[in-house]
């Protein structure tokens, strides 16, 4: 293992469609991949009128957008389906939405809001 990198070997698994897909609804998914590839966890969810509906959680594979992310945070502004990925065992147990605002000239000292966490 490379120093400073969190190895992902398992992720929280969740499938909202479990009855139709005939899988377990929730569990722990072992992540597999080539030795030279990085493994990640992900979460994807919807915000229906302020109510969080988890769609899927599980393993994700070698994606540069997930490198070195210890927390699962969606940064896109108001996506239709929220998605985040991270590195580290079960790092997708908690996930958050923290949109990156367009950079404009601040009139005062900017304040970084604390992201809402879901689990």
């Amino acid at each position: 293992a490379i120093l400073g990198r969190s190895e992902t070997q398992e992720c929280l698994f969740f499938n909202a469609n479990w009855e139709k897909d005939r899988t377990n609804q929730t569990g722990v998914e072992p992540c597999y991949g080539d030795k030279d590839k990085r493994r990640h966890c992900f979460a994807t969810w919807k915000n229906i009128s302020g109510s969080i509906e988890i769609v899927k959680q599980g393993c994700w594979l070698d994606d540069i957008n997930c490198y070195d992310r210890t927390d699962c945070v969606e940064k896109k502004d108001s996506p239709e389906v929220y998605f985040c990925c991270c590195e580290g065992n079960m790092c997708n147990e908690k996930f958050s939405y923290f949109p990156e605002m367009e950079v404009t000239q601040p009139t005062s000292n900017p304040v970084t809001p604390k992201p809402p966490y879901y689990n």
């Epitope: 499938n15 897909d21 005939r22 597999y32 599980g58 393993c59 998605f83």
Partner: antibody
Amino acid sequence: QVQLVQSGAEVKKPGSSVKVSCKASGFQFRTSLISWVRQAPGQGLEWMGGLIPIFGTANYAQKFQGRVTITADESTSTAYMELSSLRSEDTAVYYCVKDLTWTNLGLDIWGQGTMVTVSS
Amino acid sequence: EIVMTQSPSSLSASVGDTVTITCRASQGPSRWLAWYQQKPGKAPRLLIYGASPLSSGVPSRFSGSGSGTHFTLTISSLQPEDFATYFCQQSYSTPFTFGPGTKLEIK
């Protein structure tokens, strides 16, 4: 070496059944998602269903519901696909495939395919 | 059922060219979009999963992009071995469905 080795070609009569086997090696079979995909001659690809051996229950495409049975034998790392009430339109190459993840990220390891011909 | 469409259904190009194949979904498969290459008499090969990451051993001249319902596969600097049929597939909701394919031929 990660691979899926399928049983040989079959010629079947309409109304009969066929059972195709798929022997896995080089990966954790019992905790991997194994799917079946078919391709009629000169046609596109069609997902039939799949299962994760440790979960036991298979997930089938509605089109094949009631005609297809997907099973797995963990002791021999072998998956099976049985299709019944065969008709000429079932003539196709049948592939068993390993998925990257339980949430169906991509079909990364394919068997060599089994040609099933349905003819009277 | 999510219906996948691909365009063009076929195209001719020369070695060294850059080509783009488009895949559209009737409903958004989010990131659950994969691309496959198939040569005659062979099983398909996974090129791209999750809309953009490259599968193991796939050359970097292949790239995928898109989200929602619109996705593209781009092959830059075409090589002789790239002439084949390409399929997209959504695996967001069952039944998982494939596009009809795009046949890439040598001009």
